[in-house]
């Protein structure tokens, strides 16, 4: 068997040692003779010790035994005992007890011969096995004194060998990790949850993670079980970006010919149905009536102008009803209505002329007369000297319902080259000049406008009165909407409940699905926040779509230019929509084109104004606009501006 | 352009009489009346009346009752003013304005200056 | 007849001075008033009319108000060009009259 050589020389010193017995004894007797029973020089004990350093050592040490017990002439037995323990390096043992093996005296030296795992002059030194190759460790290697032991970090068990380790599989344990799934790791396990989900050590248990209290989204935040949304104030005209949490502008996709004319007065700016323009003439002279303009419109019915005095006095009234002009006329509180003429809402330009002569009005389209009245009377009126008239454009001054025959008075209508009383107007152009909102668009189509800043309401009724049912249905809702969008996101048609500030329903255009988290162009139909279905949709093409909505007891589907749309709910979910719908529908609620009221972003998926042209049929009647109980100002209600033409 | 052009300046002795002119342009002369208002030196203005462009039919302040005259040319759109047996009093700057209830147009002015 | 009392006759202020002009009438001429600058040697020029209408090419530094009896003429921030004399005139029965004047000069 070999031996390290550290302990192959601790074996072999003590052997030594005893080769040298019989020379120390007799050293010994020596050291008697001469330095114990005589006083010796440093000569003689040289000759003692044969050797100088154990006479260095030896002889400062005898002069301090003489010192202590005088010489050895005085007998005195402490000084005998003293020199006699003066060569013995190991008496008393400078070694340390617990480590050394054996002490061995050298000449004025010793040597400790330490016990294994001991080590140092003294063998008080602890050796530390884990400095070399870990002590043979696999993991742990742990110094002890005298010795040392091998461990393993935790998950792991010590083998057999008591050096290396193996891998605890605590999966075997059904408890482990209670509900969540549990999976076993070198030394460790994890207990795993779905997405949005994170595990509860306490509770041994998924739980969901409020994403929202991460600061996730840049607006508004709603958590839901496993994941979240984030909301952007779509009223302020901001969307989802494409990372789903932070806002971006809701720009338009498709460019629409929206210049105005600065030298054209438009005459639906103000849904009042008060004038755009109101004008007060007064002569000296006795003057007579002369109106010339260029006019267009696609709007079937309204007020193009007034002139006269008050109401119950003499006034003129040119409307249009059913695209024919319309005269109303009242002279010294006697009323008359005359209609005629070709229909004229083409939305074509055409010259219109009302003229004032000595005993008749003449009313002309494109220079032919289409009226010829007979008046007992003047349209300017004499007072205090002067003659007055009031000339008002797109409305008159006092209410719809004290014309002769109550008309709309709001005209979505455009004027051009006017010409009141022979005179040039600087006034009207100077302001029109300065007022975009006074200016017409240049170029217009069919349909209705929505600028993406406003909506408009009307106070309809879903439910069926008990004359209408045939079927088992009590209501329904039904609802065309041809669109030519230029913006990707923006409420087409809602239903908003003002009692409870909720949104029952709405269809609306969106650029990303919500629960895929996955930008993508749709329509999307939904009662309150719940999405029922979703349908792709070109938005962007400049095209005409047409997006067809029904609902009714039982049944929701949606339809984009005939294709049907992706049912987003089971139809367990579906009958509790649609019977929340029903409750709100049996309450009053408010029919919205174009937009939202200022509801909360979460109250539907979308809130944004839709942008580009619209017409919509509710329970197979067209919506009119100039019928609505509000329209914003900058909707136009007939007419809507091209898509501008791609350049080339 | 709507234009009123008045005669120059005149300088007129007490007694005599001054026909000064306002000549129309831009417009249908007849569709407004034409009023003529005066102005004495560093005093405000003071309106004299007006004449109805269509049947020549004049209108004076009671001050104006008298001596003056409103006439009209339609046929060169010009309308006057006539002044007989004038006084030192009547030194003033003559202005025609069209009528539009009030004025807006007027003529440059003419001064008229009665001295001995 | 209606009168019209119009103060101050005249008027000594700064460049930038907000200035004001009153006109107070005999009887109530309703929004009836018209407000006129001359300068000399030219005609008077109309820079409000009936309704407190500031007419075209009037800069916005002028405004007109009151009805009734009460008007007032404002000249928000006075310019070295609106040194001149100021004149109200009624338009609501005949005779037409006008104001006395105030004349607004350099201080």
């Known amino acids: 068997a070999l031996l390290p050589a550290r302990e192959a020389t601790q074996f072999l010193r003590p052997r030594q040692r005893r080769a040298f017995q019989v020379f120390e004894e007799a050293k010994q007797g020596h050291l008697e003779r001469e330095c114990v029973e005589e006083l010796c020089s440093r000569e003689e004990a040289r000759e003692v010790f044969e050797n100088d350093p154990e006479t260095d050592y030896f002889y400062p040490r005898y002069l301090d035994c003489i010192n202590k017990y005088g010489s050895p002439y005085t007998k005195n037995s402490g000084f005998a005992t003293c020199v006699q323990n003066l060569p013995d390096q190991c008496t008393p043992n400078p070694c340390d007890r617990k480590g050394t093996q054996a002490c061995q005296d050298l000449m004025g030296n010793f040597f400790c011969l330490c016990k294994a795992g001991w080590g140092g002059r003294l063998c008080d030194k602890d050796v530390n096995e884990c400095s070399q190759e870990n002590g043979g460790c696999l993991q742990i290697c742990h110094n002890k004194p005298g010795s040392f032991h091998c461990s393993c970090h935790s998950g792991f068990e010590l083998s057999s060998d008591g050096r290396t380790c193996q891998d605890i599989d605590e999966c075997a344990d059904s408890e482990a990790c209670g509900e969540a799934r549990c999976k076993n790791l070198p030394g460790s396990y994890s207990c795993l949850c779905d997405e949005g989900f994170a595990y509860s050590s306490q509770e041994k248990a998924c739980r969901d993670v409020d994403e929202c209290l991460q600061g996730r989204c840049e607006q508004v935040c709603v958590n839901s079980p496993g994941s979240y949304t984030c909301h952007c104030d779509g009223r302020g005209g901001l969307k989802l970006s494409q990372d789903m949490d932070t806002c971006e502008d809701i720009l338009p996709c498709v460019p629409f010919s929206v210049a105005k004319s600065v030298k054209s007065l438009y005459l639906g700016r103000m849904f009042s149905g008060t004038p755009v323009i109101r004008l007060r003439f007064k002569r000296l002279q006795p003057t007579r009536l002369v109106a010339e303009f260029d006019f267009r419109t696609f709007d079937p019915e309204g007020i193009l102008l007034f002139a006269g005095g008050h109401q119950d006095s003499t006034w003129i009234v040119l409307a249009l009803r059913a695209g024919r002009l319309e005269l109303q006329l009242r002279y010294n509180g006697v009323g008359r209505v005359t209609s005629s003429g070709p229909v004229i809402n083409h939305g074509m330009w055409q010259t219109i002329s009302v003229e004032e002569l000595a005993r008749n009005l003449v009313i002309k389209v494109n220079r032919d007369a289409v009226m010829k009245i007979a008046v007992a009377g003047d349209l300017f009126q004499p007072e205090r000297g002067l003659y007055h008239l009031n000339l008002t454009v797109g409305g008159i001054p006092f209410h719809e319902k004290d014309l002769v025959q109550p008309i709309n008075p709001r005209l979505d209508g455009c004027m051009r080259s006017w010409n009141w009383l022979n005179g040039e107007d600087t006034t009207i152009q100077e302001t029109v000049k300065v007022n975009t909102r006074m200016q017409c668009f240049s170029v217009t189509e069919r349909g209705s406008f929505y600028p993406g800043s406003g909506f408009a309401f009307y106070s309809l009724d879903y439910m069926r009165t008990p004359l209408d049912v045939g079927t088992e249905s009590t209501w329904e809702v039904e609802v065309v909407a041809h669109i030519r969008p230029a913006a990707d996101t923006g409420v087409l048609f809602a239903l908003w409940a003002p009692d409870l500030r909720a949104v029952p329903l709405s269809v609306a255009l969106v650029d990303y699905h919500s629960t895929k988290k996955l930008k993508k162009q749709l329509v999307v139909l939904a009662v309150e926040h719940t999405a029922l279905a979703l349908m792709e949709i070109k938005v962007c093409d400049g095209q005409e779509h047409v997006v067809t909505v029904s609902l009714r007891d039982g049944e929701a589907t949606l339809e984009v230019d005939g294709t049907r749309g992706q049912s987003e709910v089971s139809a367990a979910q579906l009958q509790e929509r649609l019977a929340v719908l029903e409750r709100h529908l049996r309450s009053p609620v408010l029919t919205f084109a174009g937009g939202l009221p200022d509801v909360p972003v979460t109250s539907a998926p979308v809130t944004a104004f839709y942008r580009g042209c619209m017409t919509l049929e509710v329970n197979r009647r067209l919506l009119d606009l100039d019928e609505a109980a509000y329209k914003h100002s900058d909707i136009t209600a007939h007419s809507c501006p091209p898509v501008e033409p791609a350049a080339a | 352009q709507v234009h009123l052009v008045q005669s120059g300046s005149e300088l007129k002795k007490p007694g005599a009489s001054v026909k000064i002119s306002c000549k129309a342009s831009g417009y249908t002369f007849t569709n407004y009346g034409m009023n003529w208002v005066r102005q004495a030196p560093g005093q405000g203005l003071e309106w004299m009346g007006w004449?109805?462009?269509?049947?020549?039919?004049?209108t004076y302040t009671e001050e104006f009752k008298g001596r003056f005259v409103f006439s009209l040319d339609t046929s060169v759109t010009t309308s006057y003013l006539q002044i007989s047996t004038l006084k030192a009093e009547d030194t003033a700057v003559y202005f025609c304005?069209?009528?539009?209830?009030?004025?807006?147009?007027w003529g440059q002015g003419t001064l008229v200056t009665v001295s001995s | 007849e209606t009168t019209l009392t119009q103060s101050p006759s005249s008027l000594s202020a700064s460049v930038g001075d907000r200035v004001t002009i009153t006109c107070i009438t005999s009887t109530d001429i309703d929004d009836d008033m018209n407000w006129y600058q001359q300068k000399p040697g030219k005609a008077p020029k109309l820079l409000i009319s009936e309704g407190n209408t500031l007419r075209p090419g009037v800069p916005s530094r002028f405004s007109g108000s009151g009805s009734g009896t009460d008007f007032t003429l404002t000249i928000s921030s006075l310019q070295p060009e609106d040194f001149a004399t100021y004149y109200c005139?009624?338009?609501?029965?005949?005779?037409?009259?006008f104001g006395q004047g105030t004349k607004v000069e350099i201080k």
């Open positions: 005139l009624q338009t609501d029965s005949v005779p037409l009259t």
């Open positions: 304005a069209r009528d539009e209830g009030w004025f807006v147009y």
């Open positions: 004449i109805n462009t269509n049947t020549g039919e004049p």
